[in-house]
């Protein structure tokens, strides 16, 4: 016969927000302030994350889970769970090792955080350029140029930058 | 031409996980944006995110940065989308999409998947 | 993020009737704005980009303007297939937006 998982052990009683107390003869104790565990039966209850300096808090911890950090005004997240924040630059830049440099001619990033990327080569695609690229905005692509009617101007110049622009995510 | 395929509709349980395939053709696949939207029953279209496949970059809507995960697979030009810890509201058709050459429109759609959360 | 106000959210109209839908943006974006046609199978194509270029294959009929907040897309004269939901979307800022949409029915 198949025995339950509560009969084997008796942790597995213990629900999310308490811990498996081996030292009160493995009563479920609810986790001690600033410790959460999100999952049942568990023997030890984890720190919670504090959002300190650059970090900011996103979501508070609970006993059932953990605090979440976002970064200040100015910075962005990186990595998973935003382990890291990086410093914004405007558009028209990216950041490098000796901080915020414009984007190089040929480039644009219509962010606030990556790299500044190549404008898109409308070509690829049969198409031709409808607007013009600048350091904060790609190219748009339109018709190849065969699809223009006679005498229709193919290039539109680029529409005035603008901030915000594309928010840092 | 230009194709965007995506896997078929999924039934699961709330609180499960759920990936989203979108193979695409015709096309050289690390050059264009692929974005992700949805539309719930009965609802507008809501922009998820999208994903750079040269180099992975990706960017989110805010509102599902903790529920959607964009990837990419350059050998076989294949967009993916994980949803998480699914509830009932997550109900919805899901597109992914490719850009016009730039990132500012979506030219291409594919037919849609339908994910259904539900006890 | 930038809200797109779309009106109406549906309308009635006659095989060759003059239909206009506008979309108002809440924040200047420029021209960076789409018009998409969701047929009733659910299919979703790009009819317009940049506010007033039509996608080649798109019939003459669907036209565009407008600039920084107030856009309109025009059918000049309803086609029975023209039956879909129409949504505007901004493509200046992220997280990009769509209008609600408009249900276009013929009478």
């Known amino acids: 016969f198949e025995r339950t998982r509560s009969l084997q052990d008796p942790c597995s009683n213990c629900p999310a927000g308490t811990f498996c107390d081996n030292n009160r003869n493995q009563i479920c104790s609810p986790c001690p302030p600033n410790s959460f565990s999100s999952a049942g039966g568990q023997r030890t209850c984890d720190i919670c994350r504090q959002c300190k300096g650059v970090f900011r808090t996103r979501k508070e911890c609970s006993s059932t889970s953990n605090a979440e950090c976002d970064c200040t005004p100015g910075f962005h997240c990186l990595g998973a769970g935003c382990s890291m924040c990086e410093q914004d630059c405007k558009q028209g830049q990216e950041l490098t090792k000796k901080g915020c440099k414009d984007c190089c001619f040929g480039t644009f990033n219509d962010q606030k955080r990556g790299i500044c990327r190549p404008w898109t080569n409308c070509s690829l695609d049969g198409k031709s350029v409808l607007v013009n690229g600048t350091k904060e905005r790609d190219v748009v692509c339109g018709p190849s140029p065969a699809d223009l009617s006679p005498g229709a101007s193919s290039v539109t110049p680029p529409a005035p930058a603008r901030e915000p622009g594309h928010s840092p995510q | 031409q230009v194709q965007l395929v995506q896997s078929g509709a999924e039934v699961k349980k709330p609180g499960a996980s759920v990936k989203v395939s979108c193979k695409a053709s015709g096309y050289t696949f690390t050059s264009y944006w692929i974005n992700w939207v949805r539309q719930a029953p009965g609802q507008g279209l809501e922009w998820i995110g999208n994903?750079?496949?040269?180099?992975?970059?990706?960017n989110y809507n805010q509102k599902f940065k903790d529920k959607a995960t964009i990837t990419a697979d350059k050998s076989t030009s294949t967009a993916y989308m994980e949803l998480s810890s699914l509830r009932s509201e997550d109900t919805a058709v899901y597109y992914c999409?490719?850009?016009?050459?730039?990132?500012?429109?979506?030219?291409?759609w594919g037919q849609g998947t339908t994910v259904t959360v539900s006890s | 993020d930038i809200q797109m106000t779309q009106s109406p959210s549906s309308l009635s109209a006659s095989v060759g009737d003059r239909v206009t839908i506008t979309c108002q943006a809440s924040?200047?974006?420029?021209?960076?704005l789409n018009w998409y046609q969701q047929k009733p199978d659910k299919t979703v194509k790009l009819l317009i980009y940049y506010t007033t270029r039509a996608r080649s294959g798109v019939p003459s009929r669907f036209s565009g303007s407008g600039s920084g907040t107030d856009f309109t897309f025009t059918i000049s004269s309803l086609q029975p297939e023209d039956i879909a939901t129409y949504f505007c979307?901004?493509?200046?800022?992220?997280?990009?937006?769509f209008g609600q949409g408009t249900k276009l029915e013929i009478k």
């Open positions: 924040q200047d974006i420029s021209n960076y």
């Open positions: 994903i750079y496949p040269s180099d992975s970059y990706t």
């Open positions: 979307q901004q493509g200046d800022t992220l997280p990009y937006t």
């Open positions: 999409t490719r850009d016009y050459g730039s990132a500012y429109s979506m030219s291409t």
